[in-house]
């Protein structure tokens, strides 16, 4: 009788190929050499191993690399990445953006898992900052990525990376995050002309101070109400009726529909009734 730990006669794997998918778990354990697996990792992802079989392959790699996998193995993990724990990933040193992309591809379409969050954290820490290429990659896979970072983490984003940010990447950011991002965006886009500048800076304005809003009001930007409603209340309150009228342009009529909501409500209460009446919207201060 074949001992369970011994590879049955004729089943020793000379290479990683499709025939292995028909092996039972213990056969994979007994018949696949870990070093062979490591050198032929590029083949593993092309073979439709089941979730259970991947457990065995992971176990073999863990035994071969107890201190963490080398990047040559990591970049070819493919579906095997789904089996990794955050603890496993913390042992890795991932420096190549191509490796990061390959692993994110496996998780595509799913929420950001703890494994992915750990991988990204390791990668960004290894690079020292969130550069444009990395940010481009991460927001392509996870539009909400930027807003998942703390204000402290966002402070390491260089202004040059802001060019990679799309409006939808900021949808879930809170005011504290926009406070950090806005000055970087202002710096990044400073050489653009008025209308182009406004298009780029618009989604960051939730972090803008009063003086910048006053400056924008002088540029005929026609800010929409959705953007206005995301502005910091403390930044909006000092604006005069004339400044708000210039800032919103034809959209000023939308204030009526928002008069009970912040920051419009609080701003209205700060204005003189005579000034509000000049808008002709029936706003009551």
């Amino acid at each position: 009788e074949v001992e369970k730990t011994a590879c049955p006669s004729g089943k020793k794997a000379p290479e990683i190929d499709e025939s292995l998918i028909f092996y039972k778990k213990w056969e994979l354990e007994a018949c696949v050499d870990a070093a062979l697996l490591a050198t032929q990792m590029d083949r593993v992802n092309a073979i439709p191993f089941t979730y259970e079989q991947l457990d065995v392959l992971k176990h073999k790699l863990d035994e071969l690399y107890p201190q963490g996998y080398p990047e040559s193995v990591i970049q070819h993990l493919g579906y095997l990445f789904l089996k990794m724990s955050p603890e496993d990933i913390r042992k890795w040193n991932v420096t190549s953006l191509e490796t990061l992309k390959a692993l994110l591809e496996v998780n595509k379409g799913h929420e950001m898992s703890p494994q992915v969050a750990t991988l990204i954290d390791r990668f960004v820490k290894g690079r020292g900052q969130l550069d444009k290429d990395t940010l481009d990659t991460l927001t392509a896979f996870y539009p909400g990525y930027l807003c998942s970072l703390s204000p402290e983490e966002l402070s390491s984003v260089p202004p040059s990376s802001i060019w990679a940010v799309r409006p939808q990447d900021l949808d879930t950011c809170d005011p504290r995050q926009l406070d950090v991002l806005y000055p970087k965006a202002r710096l990044a886009f400073q050489n653009m002309n008025g209308s182009e500048y406004f298009v780029k800076i618009q989604s960051f304005l939730g972090g803008a101070p009063t003086e910048d809003l006053k400056a924008l009001s002088q540029q005929n930007v026609s800010m929409d109400l959705a953007t206005f409603m995301k502005l910091r209340t403390d930044a909006v309150l000092p604006l005069t009726v004339a400044e708000v009228q210039k800032l919103l342009g034809p959209h000023v009529e939308g204030l009526k529909a928002e008069e009970r909501h912040r920051p419009v409500r609080d701003w209205i209460l700060r204005q003189r009734q005579d000034d509000l009446d000049t808008l002709g919207l029936g706003l009551q201060g």
């Epitope: 092996y23 213990w26 799913h110």
Partner: antibody, heavy 118, light 107 residues
């Protein structure tokens, strides 16, 4: 020719247990996983679980944990399914199937009908 | 659990026609999908393994395709003996799960 011969129909009382058998011919069950699948009248197929007869390792669908027990006897080339605390919900045809490491089910038995009735 | 959805409960076809039965997985199951035929009063029979490979003895008018989440069993030149229920199965991750089945009805 590969064949999986299952035991005959069972009529059992609620609360009782039943043990179904599945004997393979023309192949050694140790070389395969042996699965059990449930099919209720006019309903789909449900995977109960499987055993690796080589070492007795089993895996069950959560729904059948505690209800089903799968065993195998390699000397008689037979896999077994025991169902406990039977209720009318357990009235169904139960199939055994053999499969390779992929988890696919390649060959099926003819099925055993279990009727739970007082 | 991974849900396998066969949206068509019944499909009507004529002898000689070509018919495609589809199955959608609730998550990526790569190519770990099998197709099974169950004729009235009989046990299921394996037709296709690993999404596109025909089992021994299965006529070549049966072909499987797909990967990830979308899978198709195509029967070209349908014969009267193909009247049956057809089920898909995912065996990428346990618990393994079957589609609800598609009954092929010959006009």
């Amino acid at each position: 020719e590969v064949q999986l011969q299952q035991s005959g129909a069972e009529l059992v009382k609620p609360g009782a247990s039943v043990k179904l058998s599945c004997t393979a011919s023309a192949f050694n069950i140790k070389d395969y996983y042996m699965h059990w699948v449930k099919q209720r009248t006019e309903q789909g197929l449900e995977w109960i679980g499987r055993i690796d007869p080589e070492d007795g390792e089993t895996k069950y669908a959560p729904k059948f944990q505690g209800k089903a027990t799968i065993t195998a006897d390699t000397s008689s080339n037979t896999a077994y399914l025991q169902l406990s605390s039977l209720t009318s919900e357990d009235t169904a045809v139960y199939y055994c199937a053999s499969g390779s490491g992929t988890g696919a089910m390649d060959y099926w038995g003819q099925g055993t009908s279990v009727t739970v009735s007082s | 659990d991974i849900v396998m959805t066969q949206s068509q409960k019944f499909m009507s076809t004529s002898v000689g026609d070509r018919v495609s039965i589809t199955c959608k997985a609730s998550q990526n199951v790569r190519t770990a999908v099998g197709w099974y035929q169950q004729k009235p009063g009989q046990s299921p029979k394996a037709l296709i393994y690993l999404a596109s490979n025909r089992h021994t003895g299965v006529p070549d008018r049966f072909t499987g395709s797909g990967s990830g989440t979308d899978f198709t069993l195509t029967i070209s030149n349908v014969q009267s003996e193909d009247l049956a229920d057809y089920f898909c199965l995912q065996h990428w991750n346990s618990p393994y799960t079957f589609g609800g089945g598609t009954k092929l009805v010959i006009k």
